[in-house]
Interface confidence: medium
C-alpha cells in the first residue's frame, strides 16, 4: 500500500487486516447544499445512437438498483429518422464502485466492489474486415 | 435508524455516528476485467462524436486516477470526415463513487464521495429554441 505519515489525529485501527478494512463516512446522503452535480439529459432519446434503460436489482448492494443502457438499434439514426446500418450503435461502458453487504445482512459492514455498467451509446464507424 | 436482525458474526459498531460511519473491506472484488478505458475500446476514435481522454490524478482519493472524456468537436463527424455543426457532440456524464481520505493523510479513514465524470461522447440532435 501507500506509505502515509501517521497523524496523531487519525482514527486508530487494531484490525489485523488493516489497511484492508477501513472506516468510511457515508455522508454522501447529505444533500443539504446545492453543490451536487446537476443531472443532465434526455440524450438517451436525442442521440443518433439512442438507448433504453434496463433495471438490474440486487438488494445486498448499494445502489440496489442499477439502470443499464441498452442501445435501441444496431445501426445509427439518420436525420430522416431511418436507421443507417452502415454505422453501429455501441454502448459506452464505465466501471463504478458499489458497496456490498458482507457478511450478508450485516447492517454496518460492507465490501467495495467494482462493476462495469453501460452508461449510454455512441455511434461508431464499423471495423470492416477484408477477406484476402 | 433501521431495525435489522443482529447477526452474531457482524462487526459491532460503537461509533456514535453509526450508521453514518461503517466498516468497508477494500479487498475490492472486481466483477470485470479491463480498467484502462484506452485499452477497453477504440470507440473514442471511431465515434461520430469522438473524444479525448484526460487523466485526473488525486493521491488522496481512491481510485486515484480517473480518466475524463472531452468531446473533440462541437458538431459530429460525417462519413466524409468533415464536421456537421447541425448536430452536437455532447458528453455522457456519470456519477461515480470514490473514497476520499478524511482526515487527509489518514490511512484508514475515508469519506464516500460522489463525483461526476464524463465517460464518452454521443451525437445528438440540438434543441432549437424558437423565438416568438
Amino acid at each position: 500500500g501507500i506509505a502515509i505519515p501517521r497523524n496523531s489525529g487519525c482514527p486508530n485501527s487494531e484490525d489485523k487486516n488493516f489497511p484492508r478494512t477501513v472506516m468510511v463516512n457515508l455522508n454522501i446522503h447529505n444533500r443539504n447544499t446545492s453543490t451536487n452535480p446537476k443531472r443532465s439529459s434526455d440524450y438517451y432519446n436525442r442521440s443518433t445512437s439512442p438507448w433504453n434503460l434496463h433495471r438490474n436489482e440486487d438488494p445486498e448492494r448499494y445502489p440496489s438498483v442499477i439502470w443499464e443502457a441498452k442501445c435501441r438499434h444496431l445501426g445509427c439514426v439518420k436525420a430522416d429518422g431511418n436507421v443507417d446500418y452502415h454505422m453501429n450503435s455501441v454502448p459506452i461502458q464505465q466501471e463504478i464502485l458499489v458497496l456490498r453487504r458482507e457478511p450478508r445482512h450485516c447492517p454496518n459492514s460492507f465490501r467495495l466492489e467494482k462493476i462495469l455498467v453501460s452508461v449510454g451509446c455512441t455511434c461508431v464507424t464499423p471495423i470492416v474486415h477484408h477477406v484476402a | 435508524g433501521i431495525a435489522i436482525p443482529r447477526n452474531s458474526g457482524c462487526p459491532n459498531s460503537e461509533d456514535k455516528n453509526f450508521p453514518r460511519t461503517v466498516m468497508v473491506n477494500l479487498n475490492i472484488h472486481n466483477r470485470n476485467t479491463s480498467t484502462n478505458p484506452k485499452r477497453s475500446s477504440d470507440y473514442y476514435n471511431r465515434s461520430t462524436s469522438p473524444w479525448n481522454l484526460h487523466r485526473n490524478e488525486d493521491p488522496e482519493r481512491y481510485p486515484s486516477v480517473i480518466w475524463e472524456a472531452k468531446c473533440r468537436h462541437l458538431g459530429c463527424v460525417k462519413a466524409d470526415g468533415n464536421v456537421d455543426y447541425h448536430m452536437n457532440s455532447v458528453p455522457i456524464q456519470q456519477e461515480i463513487l470514490v473514497l476520499r481520505r478524511e482526515p487527509r493523510h489518514c490511512p484508514n479513514s475515508f469519506r464516500l464521495e460522489k463525483i461526476l465524470v464524463s465517460v464518452g461522447c454521443t451525437c445528438v440532435t440540438p434543441i432549437v429554441h424558437h423565438v416568438a
Epitope: P63, I96 | P19
Partner: antibody, heavy 126, light 107 residues
C-alpha cells in the same frame, strides 16, 4: 410493483404523539427509501423526512427536527413515522412515499416519489 | 430552502385543449424536478420525473420540459379524467419542497 399500505386514521389530543406505519410489499425493501409527506386540509404537500433503508440513514426537515422520528423494520418491511408534541396545526393527511435510490441514467440515488401510500388522517383536537 | 412557484394557481379548460403549467425554482436545480397529479381524496401520482422523463403507464399526452430554474408540464389534449391538482417537486437539495399546486378543472 411496490405497494404501500398505511395504518388507519388517528384522533389525538394536543401534546400527545402519533405513530403511523407504512407496510411495503412487492420489490425488495432494501432497494429504496421511504419519505413522509403531509397535507393539511385544503393545503399543499410538505416533506417531513425520510429513511434510506440500505444504510438506515434518516434525514429530517428542519421544521420537524426533534419532533419526528422515522424508523424501519426490515423483517416486517414496515416503515414508521412518529410525531410528538402534537398541536392542531398537525391535523393533516400523512403519506408515506417510496424514494427509489436507484443508479439511474448515470446518477446515484434517484429522489422522485414513485409510489405513495393511501394516506393516514390524523386529527388533533382537545 | 428552495422555493417552487407554480403558475397559474387555477385553470379552467375545455376538453381537447392544451394545458401548460409552469414551475419556477428560487435557484438552479438542474433537472431535479418531478411532477405529480392529485385527484380529490386520492394520493399523489408521479407523472414526470427529472423534468422530462416519462413514467410507464402515464398517458403520452403528459410531457415535461425545462432545466435550471424554469420548468413546464404540458397536457396535450386535456381529457375529463385529467381534472386534478398538479404539483411540482424538487429533490436537488434537502428539504424536498413542492410547489403550491395548480388546480385544473374542466369547463
Amino acid at each position: 410493483e411496490v405497494q404501500l399500505v398505511q395504518s388507519g386514521a388517528e384522533v389525538k389530543k394536543p401534546g400527545e404523539s402519533v405513530k403511523i406505519s407504512c407496510k411495503a410489499s412487492g420489490g425488495s425493501f432494501r432497494s429504496y427509501g421511504i419519505s413522509w409527506v403531509r397535507q393539511a386540509p385544503g393545503q399543499g404537500l410538505e416533506w417531513m423526512g425520510g429513511i434510506t433503508h440500505f444504510f438506515g440513514i434518516t434525514d429530517y426537515a428542519q421544521k420537524f427536527q426533534g419532533r419526528v422520528t422515522i424508523t424501519a423494520d426490515e423483517s416486517t418491511t414496515t416503515a414508521y413515522m412518529e410525531l410528538s408534541g402534537l398541536t392542531s396545526d398537525d391535523t393533516a393527511v400523512y403519506y408515506c412515499a417510496r424514494e427509489p435510490n436507484d443508479f439511474w441514467n448515470g446518477y446515484y440515488d434517484t429522489h422522485d416519489f414513485d409510489s405513495w401510500g393511501q394516506g393516514t388522517t390524523v386529527t388533533v383536537s382537545s | 430552502e428552495i422555493v417552487l412557484t407554480q403558475s397559474p394557481d387555477f385553470q379552467s379548460v375545455t376538453p381537447k385543449e392544451k394545458v401548460t403549467i409552469t414551475c419556477r425554482a428560487s435557484q438552479n436545480i438542474g433537472s431535479e424536478l418531478h411532477w405529480y397529479q392529485q385527484k380529490p381524496d386520492q394520493s399523489p401520482k408521479l407523472l414526470i420525473k427529472y423534468a422530462s422523463h416519462s413514467i410507464s403507464g402515464v398517458p403520452s399526452r403528459f410531457s415535461g420540459s425545462g432545466s435550471g430554474t424554469d420548468f413546464t408540464l404540458t397536457i396535450n389534449g386535456l381529457e375529463a379524467e385529467d381534472a386534478a391538482t398538479y404539483y411540482c417537486h424538487q429533490s436537488d437539495t434537502l428539504p424536498h419542497t413542492f410547489g403550491q399546486g395548480t388546480k385544473v378543472d374542466i369547463k
